[in-house]
Structures are given as C-alpha cells and as structure tokens.
C-alpha cells in the first residue's frame, strides 16, 4: 500500500507483507551489493561475514509471540535497522568514487532503496496492527522481548573492521527477514484466525 494509506482487506495486506518480507530476505538486494562495494567479495573475507548470534530476535522467539506482539517486535526491530542503515549509508563511497574505481553504481542504488522499502513495510505493519485491533477477537498480546537491540556495533578498530561489522549486520538482517517471512506464511486466511 502507498505510504500513509491502509488497505482494509486483510488478505491484500497480508499478501503485501509477505511480498515485502520475501524481497527483503533476498541478499542480492542489500548484502551482496554491500559486499561488492566494500571490497569484501573474496571467499576468505566472506567467511567473516556471519552474523553474531542474538543480534536479532530468533525465529523461535517470533513464533512464540501473538500476532500483535509479533508486529510490535518487528516494528521495533525495523526501527533499529533503519538507524543502523543510515549509519552504514554515511560510510559508503560516493557515486563518482564508485565510477572511478570501476564498481557498479546499481549496487549503490540498491543499498539506497533499502530504507524506503523498510518504511513501506512499516506502513503495512501499522495497517495490519490497526486491522487486527478492529477485528472481533482480541488475542492476548504476549509481549515481545522487544527487538533484542540490533547491532550495537562493537567499537571498530579501523575502517576494515567497520566494514565487517556492517556485513555481519546485513547478514543478520536478511536472516531475520527470512524468519519474519516464515511467520507471516503461517498466518491464517482471516484476521480472526492464526495457524500456528
């Protein structure tokens, strides 16, 4: 749905959320371009690009939440992700520098699309939360443990270390969005029923 407008059709909204999370778990849209731009596209370096456990809520944690609690946790986590992405964007080379070093400008454009895409997803999360609040059966909200604070980056000793931190963060983000997609795929066909 367009930012600021809400579909009142549960299955349209759920479809949009499923589509958005499907696209956001795709590493070719964020992690892969980041790796190329930062010069980490070397087997030995990629090995260091594994997420730190606990940086994002686990799939098990997400599955244990009620639908409202899940949306709250997802929203909070994405809020942290937006801050971290803004920080990463600041450290990216500029377009003209990329061209000079023979790197692909499309990679930079993909990275710059990440934040608008997350804002679109958050809009639909807000819409779904509204829809669930208006549906007849109130489901007890199991409070999420909030977003287990994504990625406070460890103080990076140098620029290279920061690149690796960014890489681990994005790896974790894609894995988290994969988990989110799996949770959404189990939601029922009506706002009053959840298959878990």
């Amino acid at each position: 749905a367009a930012i600021g407008s809400c579909s009142k059709e549960y299955r349209v909204l759920l479809g949009q959320l499923q589509k958005q999370t499907d696209l956001m778990q795709d590493t070719s849209r964020l992690l892969d371009p980041y790796i190329r731009i930062q010069g980490l596209d070397v087997p030995k370096l990629r090995e260091h690009c594994r997420e730190r456990p606990g940086a994002f809520p686990s799939e098990e944690t997400l599955r244990g939440l009620g639908r409202r609690g899940f949306l709250q946790t997802l929203n909070a986590t994405l809020g942290c992700v937006l801050h971290r992405l803004a920080d990463l964007e600041q450290r990216l080379p500029k377009a003209q520098d990329l061209e000079r070093s023979g790197l692909n400008i499309e990679d930079l454009e993909k990275l710059q699309m990440a934040r608008p895409n997350i804002l679109g997803l958050r809009n639909n999360i807000y819409c779904m939360a509204q829809l669930l609040d208006n549906s007849d059966t109130a489901e007890p909200t199991k409070a999420g443990r909030g977003a287990s604070q994504p990625p406070t980056p460890t103080p990076a000793s140098d620029a290279f270390q920061r690149k690796l931190e960014g890489c681990r963060f994005l790896h974790g983000y894609h894995r988290f969005m994969h988990s989110v997609g799996r949770v959404f795929s189990k939601w029922g066909e009506s706002p009053n029923r959840s298959r878990r």
């Epitope: 367009a2 579909s7 349209v12 696209l23 679109g120 795929s185 066909e189």
Partner: antibody, heavy 120, light 106 residues
Framework: QVQLVESGGGVVQPGRSLRLSCAAS????????VHWVRQAPGKGLEWVAV???????DYNAAFMSRFTISKDNSKNTLYLQMNSLRAEDTAVYYC??????????????WGRGTLVTVSS | EIVLTQSPATLSLSPGERATLSCSGS?????MYWYQQKPGQAPRLLIE???NLASGIPARFSGSGSGTDYTLTISNLEPEDFAVYYC?????????FGQGTKLEIK
Amino acid sequence: QVQLVESGGGVVQPGRSLRLSCAASGFSLTNYGVHWVRQAPGKGLEWVAVIWRGGSTDYNAAFMSRFTISKDNSKNTLYLQMNSLRAEDTAVYYCAKSPNSNFYWYFDVWGRGTLVTVSS
Amino acid sequence: EIVLTQSPATLSLSPGERATLSCSGSSSVSYMYWYQQKPGQAPRLLIEDTSNLASGIPARFSGSGSGTDYTLTISNLEPEDFAVYYCQQWSSYPPTFGQGTKLEIK
C-alpha cells in the same frame, strides 16, 4: 508440468446460469490460490475472484452477487458458477494461478481460456 | 479502486528498436506487474515486483518505476515481441489491470 485447462463455456441466454471448470495439474489447489480473470472481446483484462489454498474467497465487488467461486480439492478442480448472466458478461474466462502459497494477487500460470457468449 | 492508465495506446516500431511502455496509477502502488498477450493466447507474466524478470523471460525486457509511474522497456525488439502488454497492481483491492498497449510492427 503446471497446467490449467478451462471448460464449460458456450452460448447461453441472458438471465440463465453457467458453471465453468478449471482442471489443475502439476500442482495442488491446497497449496496455491487460483483466480478467475476475464476478457471481453477486444477489451482488457478484469479480475473476477480468487479462492485461496485454505478455501476462503475474495470477489471483485462487481460480480459478488452473481458469481460464486469454489473448488474440489479431491479433483484438483476450480469452478465459477455464474448466475443471471447478462450480455456484458460475454468474455473469455481464464483461470490463473498465484505464484506461491502466500496471498499473492498476481498470476504466473494461465489457462488458455473458455469463451462465454451471452446472447438471445 | 486504482485505475491504471497505459500509454501510448498503440506503439509502432521496427525490430531492433527500443520500446518504452508506460503505466500510471490513480494512486501510488508498491509494485507493478507486466504481462504480454498475443492474439488468441492467454497472457504471460513478464515482470514481477516492478523489476524482476519472470521465469524464462529474456533479458531484453526490463521494468522500473515507483509510486504512480512505472515503465516496461524492451531494449532490442524481436519479431515475437509484437503483442499487447498489460500492467497490473494489487497494492489496493481489487487487483486491476491497465487497458493495454498494443505494440505493432511499423
């Protein structure tokens, strides 16, 4: 391979009813949403209705009162019951599959269509 | 419902040329989908999620856009590309199609 084959079209008088069928093969209707989309002669495409894998349905408001979508999972077949037909319902009716088990309202596989002509 | 307006209604080009087809929404949509239809045949999905090529679609097809304005580009027209093209949205209920752009041989 994944295939959809429509049948049941033909010439029918205004006010009468008709039931279209769509036989699915290569996938199970319990795993995907399947839609009806129609196309009047020389015109564009118009979404009619969908039945999701769990059996819930959604309709274009323009057809909700006269058309009913249903399926028989054991036969892997989709149906469209059309009542009180009008001349403007004359069209090729296609069944089309959603691309995965999620609530995706677009269509990666289409049948060849069946022509319904409403005429006295 | 969201009305999708395609332009031009008819586009006359020669093989080897580049075709640019537009689709404009009456409201903003998240993603756009494009289909190709040849006479007497069912539509075929070309582009999903605005810019992703559907399975088996050649790389000369590409999609772009955001908000209310979307574009399908065919970079190097082949004889088999001459057909009618439809855009489709499902950000808002019900799903709707554009009225189509007919791409014909000049």
